[in-house]
Interface confidence: low
């Protein structure tokens, strides 16, 4: 899958959504989408 960057502060890597440091929330760095959900 193509990589692309959203202004909202995350990328999609092969359908895997990963946080960047500028995002807010209690679960910085957590992987979502691949597991059961979480912050985007």
């Amino acid at each position: 899958d193509a990589e692309f960057r959203h202004d909202s502060g995350y990328e999609v890597h092969h359908q895997k959504l990963v946080f960047f440091a500028e995002d807010v929330g209690s679960n910085k760095g957590a992987i979502i989408g691949l597991m059961v959900g979480g912050v985007v």
Epitope: S8, V24, V36
Partner: antibody
């Protein structure tokens, strides 16, 4: 405590649209994605997509071919799922859900009570 | 899209006996040594409830009699000693990639 409260049952005619709401409380609204899952009568579960209350970005199941739109209103901590061009096969209970991140700790889920949408002429 | 197939469709087990449900994915749901496979329980008139995530990890508050195993494409949910309150439909689900997908469900009843 975390709560997701959905809007009430709807009856719609084929070709119409329906907009279901999901009001979140008990946590910081922008911290977790809200997913939508539907279940036709006597059938299994089908994931429709999710929206990010933080960014407003959504990811949809392509099965719905542009018929579904998920939005959020941060001022009321509410997420909306709109499904257009309704057909009889869209008759189902629609659930919103929030899932914890997997971060090596505990994971649990929170679901709305479900909204029955009936499509009938 | 990843297709999830469960077997059997229904299962009747005596109280206190073991129940085993199988789930197969059309392609591997593993990534970085983690299996992105979740199990849900759904009772009539209720929303689903997460039982097992990452193939083997118990959700919060889930009784120890529920366990999950497997990796790659083949997974199993085991109820070690069936209780009356375990009568429900059980679904597997992959969350490796979008769209997330569920198995067709397995109805567990008391024999």
């Amino acid at each position: 405590q975390v709560q997701l409260v959905q809007s009430g049952a709807e009856v719609k005619k084929p070709g119409a649209s329906v907009k279901v709401s999901c009001k979140a409380s008990g946590y910081t609204f922008t911290t977790y994605a809200i997913h939508w899952v539907r279940q036709a009568p006597g059938q299994g579960l089908e994931w429709m997509g999710f929206t990010s209350p933080y960014s407003g970005v959504s990811n949809y199941n392509q099965k719905f071919k542009g018929r579904v739109t998920m939005t959020r209103d941060t001022s009321t901590s509410t997420v909306y799922m709109e499904l257009s061009s309704l057909r009889s096969e869209d008759t189902a209970v629609y659930y919103c859900a929030r899932f914890d991140n997997y971060d090596g700790g505990y994971v649990r889920d929170y679901w709305g009570q479900g909204t029955l949408v009936t499509v009938s002429s | 899209d990843i297709v999830m197939t469960q077997s059997p469709d229904s299962l009747a087990v005596s109280l206190g006996e073991r129940a085993t449900i199988n789930c197969r994915a059309s392609e591997s749901v593993d990534n970085d040594r983690i299996s992105f496979l979740n199990w849900y329980q759904q009772k009539p008139g209720q929303p689903p409830k997460l039982l097992i995530y990452a193939a083997t990890k118990q959700g919060t508050g889930v009784p120890d009699r529920f366990s999950g195993s497997g990796s790659g494409t083949d997974f199993t949910l085991t109820i070690s000693s069936l209780q009356a309150e375990d009568v429900a439909v059980y679904y597997c689900q992959q969350s490796k990639e979008f769209p997330w997908s569920f198995g067709g469900g397995t109805k567990v009843e008391i024999k």
